[in-house]
């Protein structure tokens, strides 16, 4: 009997729209009134806790009271009845939850696909949120037979797979029904052919297979899906060497129809390619498959494309009527080797005489030849066959050479380190560039490359530091031997001199002192010395600073102060910045020499 | 976290006008149903207005209804009272409240935290 609730709430679990009004009522029972000796007019209502004030109800009658809400912004509001009882003490009479959301809204961007081998699946956008349970089911039906409903799983609200087996060549309406507690809406209806959105499985068993007539093809095959029974397939093929990491594809009008191999032409000869395809319905209604596992294969091999670069040194120091030569050559790269490089080629033809041949597996060789001039040739040699021949006149001893470049240059840009010239007006047949790191410390080890005697500018090959000074030669090469050999000095990157100039007295006066100091060594410069600046000041006096060309060694300072202490140092700046030397001291005699007091 | 800022209050002669301005972040402004709140001293506190969270739907506590007007800007994400015909009794720290809805005036508070409040004194 005492736990028979004193009232109720109507409406007892209600839920309404967002922003939408409210009105509860509160109802006591008569056996409750007598007891607590109360009526409508003793309810308190309370949200959350908090009171709401007596203005805002109605009294309907003896045992009725209501409120109302306005625009209901939270998705769920606590609301007690209770009554003042005897010494204002508060009863409860009933509590409801008042759950507010959103109705759904239709669904949209209905869409089916039938993988291969599974029951078609359809997704959908089902709008806002709607703060609600909502359920949507997805419908189906042929002219003449509905099929079960799909209702969608709560973790995946917005797509379902349907229960039956998928029939092709039928046309099949599907919709999606979405239903809360405040309303139900359906999707627009689509109608179409399940046989128009397969998705196919990936071919597989895919394997590559070169050719040892052509160097630049190979051949694919693999298996098709099952699915080729029902549907005629088109295909993508892509492809990339092994360390690309961008594909390229097979022209889509090549692989239209099904098939079960393809031979891909235009490769490069001796490369690792890798391979992947993936297939649809040929007219494009439908799904691309996945893309199959990759594959890859090698192409044959072919004979090397390119002659190597090839030059030469002589030692200075020859013994009479004979000097000892190195020629020297580059590895090709790989897309010019075309295959395992097993040797290199060289003949020596003394002028009009008798012809030498060397097999080399080093990339240089070195000879002791007459002053005479000799004809050089190079080839290199693979399983395949040779290259054409790089071809290297080496002149007679007193062969002058002339024909220099023009207005040789050198600079910086983009991190690499360019060389610029004017070509001579002779023909020349390919121009020689040679750069080493100058040093105190270290010899200067040449590196080299070969350019074709078409270029006027190119960038430096090779593995180029900072802050170090280049000394870049350019030989312009013609067919009766080497030009004059043009010099000039760069650095890839400038930076300030790691130590400033140590200043010096060379002899000091009563009013003026001649300084003097080394050029910096190369090594710590970082940079080309554009110019000086020597400080200097008495312990009282002001710093007075004077600019120097970077040419000078020495420099006269007037207008001193006899019988005074000097504190002097210098500076020396490159385009990034300057450097300090150590401070020296001088003082300046009292009187001029044979001056007496 | 929600943060309520209100600001506005001043001394006022008895007749005089104010504009109190709560600025509101840390809330879907335009989706929030929002109050003004009172507490004088000695007093406990009382609802005054509260307004839909559109703004189509004002209310207004019988002791300030045609001396006060609650207005909102959903863009600047500001509540406004607007306070004419002051009286002594206005006297109070004024409070902005987020609410679950309109109970008439009396907006519903999301929860037990009162801001700094803004004071208005209407003294001679």
């Known amino acids: 009997e005492l736990l028979d609730p004193c009232g109720y709430i109507s409406p007892e679990s209600p839920v309404v729209q967002l922003h939408s009004n409210f009105t509860a009522v509160c109802v006591l029972k008569e056996k409750c009134m007598d007891y607590f000796h109360v009526n409508a007019n003793y309810i308190v209502w309370k949200t959350n806790h908090f009171t709401i004030p007596k203005e805002q109800y109605t009294i309907i009658n003896r045992t009725a009271s209501s409120v109302t809400f306005t625009d209901i912004a939270s998705l769920n509001i606590q609301l007690t009845c209770n009554i003042l009882t005897f010494g204002q003490l508060e009863q409860n009479v009933y509590g409801i939850t008042i759950i507010s959301g959103l109705p759904p809204e239709k669904p949209k961007n209905l869409s089916c696909i039938v993988n291969e081998g599974k029951k078609m699946r359809c997704e959908w956008d089902g709008g806002r949120e709607t703060h609600l349970e909502t359920n949507f089911t997805l419908k189906s039906e042929w002219a003449t037979h509905k099929f079960a409903d799909c209702k969608a799983k709560r973790d995946t609200p917005t797509s379902c797979t349907v229960d039956y087996s998928t029939v092709y060549f039928v046309n099949i309406e599907v919709w999606v029904e979405a239903e809360n507690a405040l309303g139900k809406v359906t999707s627009d209806h689509i109608n179409f052919d399940p046989v128009y959105k397969v998705k196919p499985n990936p071919p597989h068993n895919l394997s590559v297979i070169n050719s040892e007539e052509l160097s630049s093809i190979l051949k694919l095959t693999w298996t098709n899906p099952s699915i080729k029974s029902v549907i005629i397939l088109k295909y993508n093929i892509q492809y990339r060497t092994k360390d690309a990491s961008t594909w390229s594809q097979i022209p889509p009008e090549d692989t239209a129809s099904t098939r079960s191999s393809f031979t891909v032409q235009d490769l490069k000869p001796f490369t690792e390619y890798v391979f992947r395809i993936r297939c649809m319905k040929e007219d494009g209604k439908g799904y691309w498959s996945d893309w199959s596992e990759e594959a890859s294969g090698i192409t044959y091999e072919d004979r090397p494309s390119k002659a190597p670069s090839f030059w030469y040194k002589i030692d200075p120091s020859h013994t009479q009527g004979y000097r000892t030569v190195q020629l020297v050559w580059k590895t090709l790269p790989p897309f010019e080797a075309n295959g395992k490089i097993l040797d290199y080629e060289v003949t020596l033809t003394r002028w009009k005489s008798h012809l030498q041949n060397y097999t080399v597996n080093a990339t240089k060789l070195t000879v002791n030849l007459t002053n005479d001039r000799y004809l050089a040739t190079l080839t290199v040699r693979n399983l395949v066959g040779k290259s054409d021949a790089a071809v290297l006149t080496i002149p007679a001893c007193d062969f002058q050479a002339t024909h220099p470049v023009m207005d040789l240059k050198a600079f910086p840009k983009d991190n690499m380190l360019w060389v610029e010239w004017t070509t001579p007006r002779e023909s020349v047949k390919k121009y020689i560039l040679e750069w080493c790191v100058l040093s105190d410390k270290a010899p200067c080890i040449t590196d080299w490359q070969q350019e074709d005697g078409t270029v006027h500018r190119t960038y430096l090959r090779g593995n180029l530091a900072e802050s170090k000074c280049y000394l870049i030669t350019v030989t312009p090469v013609y067919a009766d031997g080497p030009g004059s050999p043009e010099s000039i000095k760069a650095y890839l990157k400038q930076a300030p001199p790691s130590k400033g100039p140590t200043v010096r007295t060379k002899k000091v006066g009563k009013n003026e002192a001649v300084l003097e100091w080394d050029q910096l060594p190369v090594d710590v410069q970082n940079g080309f010395i554009r110019n000086y600046t020597i400080f200097y000041r008495t312990i009282i006096g002001n710093e007075t600073a004077v600019n120097v060309d970077s040419s000078h060694t020495e420099y006269t300072l007037s207008s001193l102060t006899s019988d005074t202490l000097y504190m002097v140092r210098m500076a020396a700046y490159t385009d990034e910045g300057g450097k300090d030397g150590p401070e020296f001291t001088f003082t300046t005699p009292k009187f001029a020499q044979g001056e007496i007091e | 976290q929600v943060q309520l800022q209100e600001s506005g209050g001043g001394l006022v002669q008895p007749g005089g006008s104010l504009r109190l301005s709560c600025t509101a972040s840390g809330l879907t402004f335009d989706d929030s149903v929002m109050g003004w709140f009172r507490q004088a001293p000695g007093k406990g506190r009382e609802a005054v207005s509260c307004?839909?969270?559109?703004?189509?739907?004002?209310f207004y506590a019988d002791s300030v209804k045609g001396r006060f007007t609650i207005s909102r800007d959903n863009a600047k994400n500001t509540l406004y009272l607007q306070m004419n015909s002051l009286k002594p009794e206005d006297t109070a720290t004024y409070y902005c409240k987020r609410g679950h809805a309109c109970a008439g005036y009396y907006p519903i508070p999301y929860d037990d935290y009162w801001g700094q409040g803004t004071q208005v004194t209407v003294s001679s």
């Open positions: 307004i839909s969270s559109s703004g189509a739907n004002a």
